[in-house]
C-alpha cells in the first residue's frame, strides 16, 4: 500500500517538436499506476486504463485540464526566457506524497536537457536555482500573473486533495492484484551449458521476487529483466546459467502479492516449449 501514497505529474516540453508531435505532454501517476495523460495537441487531460471507470466528480477532469494548460503555457514560456535556437527539453516532476501521519509532502523539481537545475521553494513561494538558465526561467515565471501562487496551491492543496480523493474513489484500482502467469524454459548456451529463464507475465503490483532452487536449495536470483506492459501490468524474467543435463534439478520460485503463497515453477518439457 505504501507505494500508492503518491500522486506525481511527469511534465515534458520540447522547444523544437517534430511535425505532428506535441510540444508538451504530461503523464500523471498514482504510485506505480499511470492514471492521466495530457498533450498539447489534444489539450485535454484524460484518464488512463482502469481510471476511465473511476467514479469521479463531474468537473474533475476539467480541473486537471485547466491546471495542465497553465503548466503548458509556463513550460513553453520558459524557452523564450532561454533565448537562442535550442533545442531544449524541459522536464518537471510535480506532486505530493502522503506520509504515515497523513500529512502531505510536496515535490517540485525541474530538469533541463536531463540535468536537474531548478526547484520550487515552498517557503519562499518562488522557483529557484543557481545556473543562469534557472534564474532566467524563474524570473520569467515570476512575472506571469499569479503563477507562483497557482504553483503553491497546486502543490499544497490541489495535489493532496486529489490524492486523497483517488485513494477513496479509486480504491479498487489501487488494490488491484493480478498474479503472474509463469514459465521456466531452458535453452542451450555455450558448449556444456544451458540458460534457464524464469518468466513472469502480466502481473500487478510491480513488486515481485524470482529465485532459483537446485534440488530444493537456494541457487541464486540470476540476471533479471523487468518492465511495464501497455495495459498497466508488468513483466519480469530472470536467467541462470547451469550445466547441460542438470536443468531438471532446478525450479523457480515466485513471490507476489497476487499469490496466496510462493509458487514453484517447474521446467517445461521441450515438447511444450515449442
Amino acid at each position: 500500500a505504501e507505494s500508492h501514497l503518491s500522486l506525481l505529474y511527469h511534465l515534458t516540453a520540447v522547444s523544437s517538436p517534430a511535425p505532428g508531435t506535441p510540444a508538451f505532454w504530461v503523464s500523471g501517476w498514482l504510485g506505480p499506476q499511470q492514471y492521466l495523460s495530457y498533450n498539447s495537441l489534444r489539450g485535454e487531460a484524460e484518464p488512463c486504463g482502469a481510471w476511465v471507470w473511476e467514479n469521479q466528480v463531474s468537473w474533475y477532469w476539467e480541473k486537471e485540464t485547466t491546471d495542465l494548460r497553465i503548466k503548458e503555457k509556463l513550460f513553453l514560456e520558459a524557452f523564450k526566457a532561454l533565448g537562442g535556437k535550442g533545442p531544449y527539453t524541459l522536464q518537471g516532476l510535480l506532486g505530493c506524497e502522503l506520509g504515515p501521519d497523513n500529512t502531505s509532502v510536496p515535490t517540485a523539481k525541474f530538469a533541463l536537457n536531463g540535468e536537474e537545475f531548478m526547484n520550487f521553494d515552498l517557503k519562499q513561494g518562488t522557483w529557484g536555482g543557481d545556473w543562469p538558465e534557472a534564474l532566467a526561467i524563474s524570473q520569467r515565471w515570476q512575472q506571469q500573473d499569479k503563477a507562483a501562487n497557482k504553483e503553491l496551491t497546486f502543490l499544497l492543496f490541489s495535489c493532496p486533495h486529489r490524492l486523497r480523493e483517488h485513494l477513496e474513489r479509486g480504491r479498487g484500482n489501487l488494490e488491484w492484484k493480478e498474479p503472474p502467469s509463469m514459465r521456466l524454459k531452458a535453452r542451450p548456451s555455450s558448449p556444456g551449458f544451458s540458460v534457464l529463464t524464469c518468466s513472469a507475465f502480466s502481473f500487478y503490483p510491480p513488486e515481485l521476487q524470482l529465485r532459483f532452487l537446485r534440488n530444493g536449495l537456494a541457487a541464486g536470483t540470476g540476471q533479471g529483466d523487468f518492465g511495464p506492459n501497455s495495459d498497466g501490468s508488468f513483466h519480469a524474467s530472470s536467467s541462470l546459467t547451469v550445466k547441460s543435463g542438470d536443468e531438471h534439478h532446478y525450479c523457480c520460485i515466485v513471490q507476489h502479492a497476487g499469490l496466496a503463497q510462493p509458487l514453484r515453477v517447474e521446467l517445461e518439457s521441450p515438447a511444450k516449449s515449442s
Epitope: 526566457a81 532561454l82 533565448g83 537562442g84 535550442g86 533545442p87 536537457n113 540535468e115 543557481d130 545556473w131 543562469p132 538558465e133 534564474l135 532566467a136 524563474s138 524570473q139 520569467r140
Partner: antibody, heavy 121, light 106 residues
C-alpha cells in the same frame, strides 16, 4: 563577430573597491546567453566569479558573495564587476566571458583578452 | 564545491608523440569542457561536453571520460600545442576549473 574587452585600473589599494567594465561588440547582451567574470591568479588558477544573464538575473560564487556585485548598462552594451574590500589575494588577471548554448550544452565560447589588476599599497 | 584535479601539473612531450592529460573531479559530473591557454593570451574553448571539438580545433585533439574521470588526448603533438590546458565542470554549482596542465615541448 562578438568581441569582449575588459577595462579598469591596473592598481588598487587594499580595502578599496575594484571596478571593472566589460564592453561587448558584435552581440547584444540582452539578446541571449550569460555574461561572466572569471579571474586567473598569478599561479594560473582560474576562479569563476559571477554572471549576469541576458534576462538581467545575476548570481555569484558563494565564496565571494558578500563583497561582489555585477550590473550592466544595456544602452552601452557593457557589464560591470565591483569587488569590495580588496586584499592582495585579489591580485589577478580578470577576464569577462560569454557562456553560450549549443548542442545541449553551455560553455564559454568567447573570452576577453583580460586585464591585470594588482592590489598593493 | 567540486574540486577538479589535473595531472600531471607539467608535462614535456616530443613532437609527434601521443599525449593524454587527465582531470579528476571530487564528485561525479555529467560532462567536462577543456580550454587551451597559450602564454599571454586568454583561455580558448577546445572541447565541450567531454568529446565535442570546438570550431576550428584540429582533429588530433579528442576527449573522453565519465563520472569523476576525464581525459584529453592529443594524438600527435605539434609545436603549436604547447600551452596550458584546463578542464571545467558545470554539473554542480558553482562553475569550477582544474588547476591546469602545462604542456611543453621536449
Amino acid at each position: 563577430q562578438v568581441q569582449l574587452k575588459e577595462s579598469g585600473p591596473d592598481l588598487v589599494k587594499p580595502s578599496q573597491s575594484l571596478s571593472l567594465t566589460c564592453t561587448v561588440t558584435g552581440y547584444s547582451i540582452t539578446s541571449g546567453y550569460s555574461w561572466h567574470w572569471i579571474r586567473q591568479f598569478p599561479g594560473n588558477k582560474l576562479e569563476w566569479m559571477t554572471y549576469i544573464h541576458s534576462s538581467g538575473s545575476t548570481n555569484y560564487n558563494p565564496s565571494l558573495k558578500s563583497r561582489i556585485s555585477i550590473t550592466r548598462d544595456t544602452s552601452k552594451n557593457q557589464f560591470f564587476l565591483q569587488l569590495k574590500s580588496v586584499t592582495t589575494e585579489d591580485t589577478a588577471t580578470y577576464y569577462c566571458a560569454r557562456e553560450v548554448y549549443g548542442n545541449y550544452y553551455w560553455y564559454f565560447d568567447v573570452w576577453g583578452a583580460g586585464t591585470t589588476v594588482t592590489v598593493s599599497s | 564545491d567540486i574540486v577538479m584535479t589535473q595531472s600531471p601539473a607539467i608535462m614535456s612531450a616530443s613532437l609527434g608523440e601521443e599525449i593524454t592529460l587527465t582531470c579528476s573531479a571530487s564528485s561525479s559530473v555529467s560532462y567536462m569542457h577543456w580550454y587551451q591557454q597559450k602564454s599571454g593570451t586568454s583561455p580558448k574553448l577546445l572541447i565541450y561536453s567531454t568529446s565535442n571539438l570546438a570550431s576550428g580545433v584540429p582533429a588530433r585533439f579528442s576527449g573522453s571520460g565519465s563520472g569523476t574521470s576525464y581525459s584529453l588526448t592529443i594524438s600527435r603533438m605539434e609545436a603549436e600545442d604547447a600551452a596550458t590546458y584546463y578542464c571545467q565542470q558545470r554539473s554542480s554549482y558553482p562553475y569550477t576549473f582544474g588547476g591546469g596542465t602545462k604542456l611543453e615541448i621536449k
